[in-house]
C-alpha cells in the first residue's frame, strides 16, 4: 500500500495505491483511491507511466480526456466512472501486455487539493493448477497441470502424511511453450503415490503462487486449488 500526500494552497489530499500484477492477455486493474470530493466537475484523474511520454489515461470534468494518451494504451484503458465521485480512481487495463509492467503514478486533483501515489505493476502469467490421478501410468501417479505461466515457475510437491519430505526424486516437471511463444504450460508428474493421503502441487514465480490439492482415498477423490498474488502491497 502506497499513500501519497499532495501539496496545495488548501490542503493535500491522500491518494492510496496498491501494487498489483496483471495476467497477460487478460484485463487488469491498477488500484487507486483518494479522498472523495462532492462534485464531479472538479475531479481530475491522471495516470502516468515512468518512461512513457504520453498519458496512460486522463479523466476530467466528468469525461475521459484522451487527446494526450500514449499510443501503447490507446483503446485499452477505462476508469470506473460511477465510482469516481466516491474516491475510486482505479484504472481498468484491457489485454495486459508484458510491456505494461513498470511504475505508474496516480495523480489526483479535486477542489480540496492535489495528491499522488506510485504503484508497481508486474506482468506475467499465472493460472490455477489441476491435480488428477494418472490412470495411464504403471504405478499410482498424480499429474499436476497449469495452462499458463510466465516467467518460468518452480514446482514443488508436498504431502500431508510425509510432511517435510523432498519429492524431487520422485517427480518430473516439464514446461511447454504455448502458441503465443511467451507463456508456458506446466506439467508435473508425481510417482509412487500412496492412498489415503493429501498431496499438494505448488507452483510459484515472482508474481503468483498457486496450489492444487488432491486427496485420494479408496472411495473418493477430493480436489481443491488456490491462487495468490504475491506483491499486493499498498502504497
Amino acid at each position: 500500500l502506497i499513500i501519497g500526500f499532495g501539496i496545495s494552497g488548501r490542503h493535500s489530499i491522500t491518494v492510496t495505491t496498491v501494487a498489483s500484477a496483471g495476467n497477460i492477455g487478460e484485463d487488469g486493474i491498477l488500484s487507486c483511491t483518494f479522498e472523495p470530493d462532492i462534485k464531479l466537475s472538479d475531479i481530475v484523474i491522471q495516470w502516468l507511466k515512468e518512461g512513457v511520454l504520453g498519458l496512460v489515461h486522463e479523466f476530467k470534468e466528468g469525461k475521459d480526456e484522451l487527446s494526450e494518451q500514449d499510443e501503447m494504451f490507446r483503446g485499452r484503458t477505462a476508469v470506473f466512472a460511477d465510482q469516481v465521485i466516491v474516491g475510486n480512481a482505479s484504472l481498468r487495463l484491457k489485454n495486459v501486455q508484458l510491456t505494461d509492467a513498470g511504475t505508474y503514478k496516480c495523480y489526483i486533483i479535486t477542489s480540496k487539493g492535489k495528491g499522488n501515489a506510485n504503484l508497481e505493476y508486474k506482468t506475467g502469467a499465472f493460472s490455477m493448477p489441476e491435480v488428477n490421478v494418472d490412470y495411464n501410468a504403471s504405478s499410482e501417479t498424480l499429474r499436476c497441470e497449469a495452462p499458463r505461466w510466465f516467467p518460468q515457475p518452480t514446482v514443488v510437491w508436498a504431502s500431508q502424511v510425509d510432511q517435510g519430505a523432498n519429492f524431487s526424486e520422485v517427480s518430473n516437471t516439464s514446461f511447454e511453450l504455448n502458441s503465443e511463444n511467451v507463456t508456458m504450460k506446466v506439467v508435473s508428474v508425481l510417482y509412487n503415490v500412496t492412498i489415503n493421503n493429501t498431496y499438494s502441487c505448488m507452483i510459484e514465480n515472482d508474481i503468483a503462487k498457486a496450489t492444487g490439492d488432491i486427496k485420494v482415498t479408496e472411495s473418493e477423490i477430493k480436489r481443491r486449488s488456490h491462487l495468490q498474488l504475491l506483491n499486493s502491497k499498498a502504497s
Epitope: 462534485k39 464531479l40 466528468g62 465521485i85 466516491v86 480540496k112
Partner: antibody
Framework: QVQLVQSGAEVKKPGASVKVSCKAS????????MHWVKQAPGQGLEWIAA????????DYNQKFKGKAKITAVTSTSTAYMELSSLRSEDTAVYYC??????????WGQGTMVTVSS | EIVLTQSPATLSLSPGERATLSCKAS??????VAWYQQKPGQAPRLLIS???YRYTGVPDRFSGSGSGTDFTLTISSLEPEDFAVYYC?????????FGGGTKVEIK
Amino acid sequence: QVQLVQSGAEVKKPGASVKVSCKASGYTFTSYWMHWVKQAPGQGLEWIAAIYPGNSDTDYNQKFKGKAKITAVTSTSTAYMELSSLRSEDTAVYYCTTTVAHYFDYWGQGTMVTVSS
Amino acid sequence: EIVLTQSPATLSLSPGERATLSCKASQDVSFAVAWYQQKPGQAPRLLISSASYRYTGVPDRFSGSGSGTDFTLTISSLEPEDFAVYYCQQHYNTPLTFGGGTKVEIK
C-alpha cells in the same frame, strides 16, 4: 449495515436556534461526506451543505450560509446541523444523507423542525 | 447554479404500464445524475446513480439513461408499490441540486 439515526422532532419559536444530530454506524465515518437536505412541507428536496469528517472540510449552498452550521464529532460518529435565527420558512423535515458507494445511498429517517410562535 | 427540470409534474398511469420520466439540466452535467424515489412520510431512496447504474436491491424494471443535459428514468411495468414521487439530482457541481419531482399516481 450502514445506519443514520437522527434526533427527534423539534418545535421552536421564531428567532431561536435548533441543533439536529445524525449518528452514523456501519461504515468508516471519517472517510465519506455527510450531507444535509431540507424538505419543506409538500415541497421538493434542497441541498444545504456537506462535511467531510476526516478533515472537517465543509461545502455550503450559498443560500444556507449564515443559516446552517454543520459540524462532526468523529469520536461518536455523529454529524450535527445547527439552524439559527429560525423563521416560519425553516419549518421542514431535515435529512442527513451520506455517499458511501454511490451518491446519497443512505439516508437518516428525517427530523421535523417546526417553527411556530 | 445548475437547474434540473423534471417533466411531467404528474404522471397518471395504471399498474403494468410503462412510465417515462424526464430530467433536463440547464448545462452539461456529464453522467452525474442520480434518481430517487420518495413515498409519503419516508426518506428518499436511491434508485439509479451516475445516470444508469441501478443501485443494489433495486428491481430491474427501473432503468436510467442519458448524459450531458437529458436524462430519463424508465419503469418498464409499474407495480403498485412504484406509485410515488421521483426526483433527479446532479452532483456535477455545487450547489448540488434536485429536480422539482415527478409524481407517479394511479390512474
